[in-house]
């Protein structure tokens, strides 16, 4: 009876289990009743990093100097090339497909440490009482405006991305020593 599943490092084809090709080799022909799977090593600048039945090897990644990339680790028949950025530049992603001078901190985050030749910008979330409404590589989180020091009241609460909105007090204390009595704006305050 033909198998319905195969062992590890095997694959099912034409009702029989064939060996997969090892890393660094590609499939030339499937096994038969009488022959083993035929595999061939990947060529120069090619690789396959898993046990496989691929008929083509993958091309090594090209570290394009025009994008600021250089080879960090040369690829082998079993591993891809690893790129990194020129000194002072930083990868845009883990895959390092392009380089930027430094990354920016998004709204809601402030710069904790400005980038150097060695380390990229370090961002930190703005804590309560602070905000950042810009993308920046140098601006820290800014403190919310203190409405009280301007003799105003908070009309809209601040967030990590927005400042508070201050506005005039609806009712002002009577300056005439009226026992702390609240008076509507414009009444007895000299306002027009």
């Amino acid at each position: 009876e033909p198998p319905t599943a195969c062992r590890e490092k095997q694959y099912l084809i034409n009702s029989q289990c064939c060996s997969l090709c090892q890393p660094g080799q590609k499939l030339v022909s499937d096994c038969t009743e009488f022959t083993e799977t035929e595999c061939l090593p990947c060529g120069e600048s090619e690789f396959l990093d898993t046990w496989n039945r691929e008929t083509r090897c993958h091309q090594h990644k090209y570290c394009d100097p025009n994008l600021g990339l250089r080879v960090q680790q040369k690829g082998t028949s079993e591993t891809d090339t690893i790129c990194t950025c020129e000194e002072g530049w930083h990868c845009t992603s883990e895959a390092c497909e392009s380089c930027v001078l430094h990354r920016s901190c998004s709204p809601g985050f402030g710069v904790k440490q400005i980038a150097t030749g060695v380390s990229d910008t370090i961002c930190e979330p703005c804590p309560v009482g602070f905000f950042s409404n810009v993308s920046s590589a140098f601006e820290k989180c800014h403190p919310w405006t203190s409405c009280e020091t301007k003799d105003l009241v908070v009309q809209q609460a601040g967030t990590n991305k927005t400042d508070v909105v201050c506005g005039p007090q609806d009712r002002l204390r009577d300056p005439g020593g009226g026992g702390g009595r609240l008076v509507p704006r414009g009444f007895g305050t000299g306002d027009p």
Epitope: L67, L69, V100, L101, E139
Partner: nanobody, 116 residues
Framework: EVQLLESGGGLVQPGGSLRLSCAAS????????MWWVRQAPGKGLERVSA????????YYADSVKGRFTISRDNSKNTLYLQMNSLRAEDTAVYYC?????????RGQGTLVTVSS
Amino acid sequence: EVQLLESGGGLVQPGGSLRLSCAASGFTFRDYEMWWVRQAPGKGLERVSAINPQGTRTYYADSVKGRFTISRDNSKNTLYLQMNSLRAEDTAVYYCAKLPTYFSDRGQGTLVTVSS
């Protein structure tokens, strides 16, 4: 296509002054944070100064604080760096950069040499 063209470099004596300019095109200049960075011979990139899109907030590296002033004219799409009290250690190629700056977007830079 982003283009940044730096100018104003040259040979100057220690204690002298220079004003660098950076003419920007290919993007909406007034929307971007801008930076000056420099690379001294045989050394890595140093971030010198930055300015926010409106020109109201700035950053200076400790090495240039009190001597350099960054500014921008959004109507002329131009970034400036006024450099006073220049020292031998300010000798470098100066580049302007937008945020974010991709390697492929960088300008050619302008060489500043401080020497007697």
